[in-house]
């Protein structure tokens, strides 16, 4: 019973996802004290970000609606030190952050992290201003890492009659135009909870009109063809679904993709069992279906994106969201999203406060980073279908795509299967005809060290994954399997399998 037969549907792609399907975010709270944006100047962080290109970098979060651009604001001493240290260099071949500045900021970061998390839990948000230097820092990080910046604008700046006040956005657009910064835009974050956060209720129709106003601003600027995404609502519970519907009716015409957010759990109460529970993983399915129902009933054909998503809200679950255990949720969400037709999934966060980051405060990559990197290298944009034969086996979850054609090791027609084993025994996967005797490369991820699933280090096919140096990612070495052998997937592990020479015409 530990041998499992798979079924594939490869006649034609179910969906086509974006080359930037797996994308990342920087939470806007990083700009609460703009000095900490200097971390984005780290060459190591940029190397890690470059590994995930092509991808979007969304700058957004609750703080989006409490940030105000002040073009006259002076840079901090630390920011000036950073920019001065870069003066004689190619902006993208950045030298390190000045050591004294980095040391000072690192020592202050744990306190700042607590400030940000406390603000979040107490739902008491204060306005902060950010300067031209902050915008430069963000844009340079994205641009030098090969990421496309999506900038979230403050939607809580309102006139007396609750229309959106676009004057601050205009200042930012003018500055970005002057610097020839090419980026996309959002307006507001989780507007469904504005009442809770700011004692202001904005209905979906009003928000739709606000988006039209922003679109008009963009058309008048050098951003004539800039993309606009929204409304970044939370999970589609009744009132939020209604808000999304009325928003799309009023303003759906001007957005390029519909964005919504999803978290499985509350970070304060989540348990290891939750992270490994197929019932928890499956709740995502109904949320996706609900969003698609709303879109189909108002703006059919409009692309749907997960504009912010992770395992647990509130910064993640301590000792869980940054461990190997988080990978089950992350990989399953990627698989389900692709299978159900979501075009882009933005992971909260690439780097920043909390526990759900891909890269920690020392700029060291965590298990979900390595999982994301493998996904980028191996998984293509054409989505196919794999399923487990026989009775429903929700503890064994399988997904199938054409292999990434940008990977020089593989060729058009190859297949990438990725699988998650939530059983406590090894499962052996058997490929269907005509693939069972093909050469297969295995990329098995398992935790390293005594902490097991709660480890923050990971092995690929038995080799520990770590950076070669600050500028170099390690090679991701495959393990070729004997043709015709079943694909072993140990208990509580996940793996990619590339089926070579599959010659699938749909790919």
């Amino acid at each position: 019973q530990d041998v499992v037969d798979l079924d594939f549907f490869t006649q034609q792609p179910l969906h086509l996802v974006s080359p930037s399907f797996l994308s990342v975010t920087i939470d806007a709270n990083l700009a609460t004290d703009p000095r900490f944006l200097i971390f984005l100047g780290s060459p190591k962080l940029r190397t890690l970000a470059r590994g995930l290109s092509p991808a979007y970098l969304r700058f957004g979060g609750t703080k989006t609606d409490f940030l105000i651009f002040d073009p006259k604001k002076e840079s901090t001493f630390e920011e000036r030190s950073y920019w001065q240290s870069q003066v004689n260099q190619d902006i993208c071949k950045s030298g390190s952050i000045p050591p004294d500045v980095e040391e000072k900021l690192r020592s202050e970061w744990p306190y700042q992290e607590q400030v940000l998390l406390r603000e979040h839990y107490q739902k008491k948000f204060k306005n902060s201003t950010y300067s031209r230097s902050s915008v430069d820092m963000l844009y340079t990080f994205a641009n030098c890492s090969g990421l496309d910046l999506i900038f979230g604008l403050n939607a809580l700046l309102r006139t007396a009659d609750l229309q959106w006040n676009s004057s601050n956005a205009q200042l930012l657009l003018d500055y970005c135009s002057s610097k020839r910064y090419n980026m996309s835009w959002e307006l507001g974050n989780e507007p469904n909870s504005f009442l809770k956060k700011a004692d202001i209720f904005i209905n979906g129709s009003q928000l739709g009109e606000d988006f039209i106003q922003l679109h008009k601003l963009l058309r008048k600027s050098t951003f004539k063809n800039a993309k606009l995404y929204g409304p970044d609502v939370g999970q589609p519970r009744r009132k939020t679904a209604e808000m999304l519907k009325s928003f799309l009716k009023a303003g759906g015409e001007v957005i390029d993709s519909v964005t919504w957010h999803h978290y499985y759990l509350n970070g304060r109460t989540a348990t290891e069992e939750d992270f490994l529970n197929p019932d928890v993983l499956d709740i995502f399915i109904s949320s996706v279906q609900k969003v698609f129902q709303v879109v189909e009933s108002t703006r059919p054909g409009k692309k749907v994106w997960l504009g912010e998503t992770s395992s647990a809200y509130g910064g993640g679950a301590p000792l869980l969201s940054d461990t190997f255990a988080a990978g089950f949720m992350w990989l399953d969400k990627l698989g389900l999203s692709a299978r159900m037709g979501i075009e882009v999934v933005m992971r909260q966060v690439f780097f920043g406060a909390g526990n759900y980051h891909l890269v920690d405060e020392n700029f060291d990559p965590l298990p979900d980073y390595w999982l994301s990197l493998l996904f980028k290298k191996l998984v293509g944009t054409k989505v196919l279908m794999a399923s487990v034969k026989g009775p429903k086996r929700r503890n064994l979850r399988v997904y199938l795509h054409c292999t990434n054609t940008d990977n020089p090791m593989y060729k058009e027609g190859d297949l990438t299967l990725y699988a998650i084993n939530l059983y406590n025994v090894t499962k052996y996967l058997r490929l269907p005809y005509p693939f069972f005797d093909k050469q297969v490369d295995k990329y098995l991820l398992r935790p390293l060290g005594p902490h097991g699933l709660l480890s923050k280090a990971v092995q690929l096919n038995g080799q520990t994954l770590k950076m070669v140096d600050d500028q170099t990612l390690p090679p991701l070495m495959e393990k070729p399997l004997r043709p015709g052998s079943s694909l072993g997937l140990p208990a509580f592990s996940y793996s990619f399998f590339v089926i070579r020479n599959a010659k699938v015409a749909a790919c």
Epitope: E209, I212, K216, K249, E253, T298, G301
Partner: antibody
Amino acid sequence: QVQLQESGPGLVKPSQTLSLTCTVSGGSISSGGYYWSWIRQHPGKGLEWIGFIYYSGSTFYNPSLKSRITISVDTSKNQFSLKLSSVTAADTAVYYCARPYSSSWYGAFDIWGQGTMVTVSS
Amino acid sequence: SYELTQPPSVSVSPGRTASITCSEDKLGNKYAYWYQQKPGQSPVLVIYQDSERPSGIPERFSGSNSGNTATLTISGTQAMDEADYYCQAWDSSTVVFGGGTKLTVL
């Protein structure tokens, strides 16, 4: 270059159902994500939007006509159709099929059929 | 319900500027579109998204939209511009047309 051509009977009796078809040539009805529309114009009067359909079958109708309209699509024939039930003399008009100028912008039409005159009379 | 109001007729001398208005509460919060229709012909889109001109439409056609009013302006009006003009907007999943304005070139 996409072209649209309306077809159907020019005369319909009161209380019957008006049926028109729009044939799309020069492009596929199911590519590009366009909303395919019906618009009418009463003699000597202005334009009135009837409704539109997406290739997946999702429809949107003018609220004032909603109870009498059915718009359907046949991707295999590259056609979409209008049915208007319980017609009266007030439904006498030139009926146009139209397509928006862009797949993102549903409400502005840059490709129109030449129109077909439908008279409701016994 | 949403109604776009246009003057029934506007007259202009050749070479002068003609302005046709389209009104509705907070129309400036939406995008306005304009069509030209000559007798016996199908409508032609002349302005989209308030002020954009489709390819092939002469530069003398321009548009604006703010407050409660969208305006179609034809500068240096020519005899060939004599036609009916319709404004149009999108309101909550429905398309709404104005009643039309007959432009007469004197």
